[in-house]
Interface confidence: medium
């Protein structure tokens, strides 16, 4: 046969399922093959790419007495804590031979509730001078909506509605509490409370 | 069987854009890095960039930075690489090729010759 | 980026003879992983797509002739043509595929 096709003689009888999750999740893919004679070394692929570094196991179960009998292998690739980096396209790969065999492919996706890249900090200000407070949060799912908060009060009638990343507070009189809510199609996730605190004139 | 379909040639008008086309038939298209290569005249092979149409991922050549843009089709199987602002420097054979994990691309289109000419 | 340099850039040769040419890459291209050399031999006829002779530095790609033999490892490697043929009138390209791709110049073989 042609070197790297994929036709009938692919040897993957398993092929990596699908993981979707929140962030911290832990899930495990698995390809399972049968081959003639030695057991090659299963490879995983991300988006193409040989993963050089993965953590996975591989398990080889001889299916008669010789040496060139079949054998069933197992490879399994743990994905622990999952991150935005950790998404794509999961493949096997092995080389038999001078051929090439790849497995159909498997997807890990990230999916849950917002996740705050920046969330607001306490400080310290002059009375009746104008600051401005950050918070930024991403998904997946996408779009994540901001609503501010001001001693528990919305600052806007809906999230998306006001101010985003960048909130605008033109000056304080007394000590104050502000904190972002991050809104997407999974739900809602709060940011830590930053207390702005006032000094006297 | 495996093939990667281009069209035989283009003319272009200097300072235009072009849209080169690859279509792919015969395995899992979204499995396999689609790879870009410019042939001048007389010169050898520069590689310009790929592009893994699973995700849409690219890599470029810095040479060719500002002058490719790689895409993907995934409903039609056909990746395209889009080439700016053109001059005669640009009027070469351009070929995609198919890339085979464990290093080399298995099959390879039959290039398109792209004239850049008023 | 790896660079590839290929020699020489031509030569000229009566059929039945031997030949070798050389081409050197700026950095290893053993996956120690995979235990592969990640680098191709093409061979290149005038308005023709280049076609795979060898891969993984000393693998003959089905259907190529036994005369064709690539050899080397890490940086240093060899395409051999033990005994040329009047067909083989082309330009021989190696490539590198460790990290994306890379093109020697090319080594243009010519029948006496």
């Known amino acids: 046969a042609p070197r790297g096709t994929q036709a009938e003689e692919s040897p993957f009888v398993g092929n990596p399922g699908n993981i979707t999750g929140a962030r911290g999740l832990t899930g495990t893919l698995r390809c399972q093959l049968q081959v003639q004679g030695e057991p090659p070394e299963v490879h995983w692929l991300r988006d193409g790419q040989i993963l050089e570094l993965a953590d996975s196991t591989q398990t080889q179960v001889p299916l008669g007495e010789d040496e060139q009998d079949d054998w069933i292998v197992v490879s399994q690739l743990r994905i622990t804590s999952l991150q935005l980096s950790d998404t794509g396209q999961y493949q096997c790969l092995v080389f038999l031979g001078h051929q090439t065999f790849v497995s159909q492919p498997g997807y890990v996706g990230l999916e849950g509730l917002p996740y705050f890249l920046e969330e607001p900090e306490d400080r310290t200000v002059a009375a009746n001078t104008p600051f401005n407070l950050s918070c930024q949060a991403q998904g997946p799912p996408e779009p994540v909506d901001l609503l501010w908060l001001q001693d528990a009060v919305p600052l806007a009638t809906a999230p998306g509605h006001g101010p985003q990343r960048s909130l605008h507070v033109p000056g304080l009189n007394k000590t104050s509490s502000f904190s972002c809510e991050a809104h997407n199609a999974k739900g809602v996730t709060t940011s830590r409370t930053a207390t702005i605190t006032v000094l006297p004139q | 069987q495996v093939q990667l379909q281009q069209p035989g040639a283009e003319l272009v008008k200097p300072g235009a854009s072009v849209q080169l086309s690859c279509k792919a038939s015969?395995?899992?298209?979204?499995?396999?890095?689609i790879n870009w290569v410019k042939q001048r005249p007389g010169q050898g092979l520069e590689w310009m960039g790929n592009?893994?149409?699973?995700?849409?991922?690219?890599n470029y050549n810095e040479k060719f930075k500002s002058k490719a843009t790689l895409t993907v089709d995934k409903s039609s199987s056909t990746a395209y690489m889009q080439l700016s602002s053109l001059t005669s420097e640009d009027s070469a054979v351009y070929f995609c090729?198919?890339?085979?994990?464990?290093?080399?691309?298995?099959?390879w289109g039959q290039g398109t010759t792209l004239t850049v000419s008023s | 980026d790896i660079v590839m340099s290929q020699s020489p850039s031509s030569l000229a040769v009566s059929a039945g003879e031997r030949v070798t040419m050389s081409c050197k890459s700026s950095?290893?291209?053993?996956?120690?992983?995979?235990?592969?050399?990640?680098l191709a031999w093409y061979q290149q006829k005038p308005g023709q797509s280049p076609k795979l002779l060898i891969y993984?530095?000393?693998t003959r790609e089905s259907g190529v002739p036994d005369r064709f033999t690539g050899s080397g490892s890490g940086t240093d490697f060899t395409l051999t043509i033990s005994s040329v043929q009047a067909e083989d009138l082309a330009v021989y390209y190696c490539?590198?595929?460790?990290?994306?791709?890379?093109f020697g110049g090319g080594t243009k073989l010519e029948i006496k």
């Open positions: 592009i893994f149409p699973g995700s849409s991922s690219t």
């Open positions: 015969g395995y899992t298209f979204i499995s396999f890095w």
């Open positions: 950095q290893s291209l053993l996956n120690t992983r995979t235990r592969k050399n990640y």
């Open positions: 490539k590198q595929s460790y990290n994306l791709w890379t």
């Open positions: 993984w530095a000393s």
């Open positions: 090729a198919r890339d085979y994990y464990g290093g080399s691309p298995d099959y």
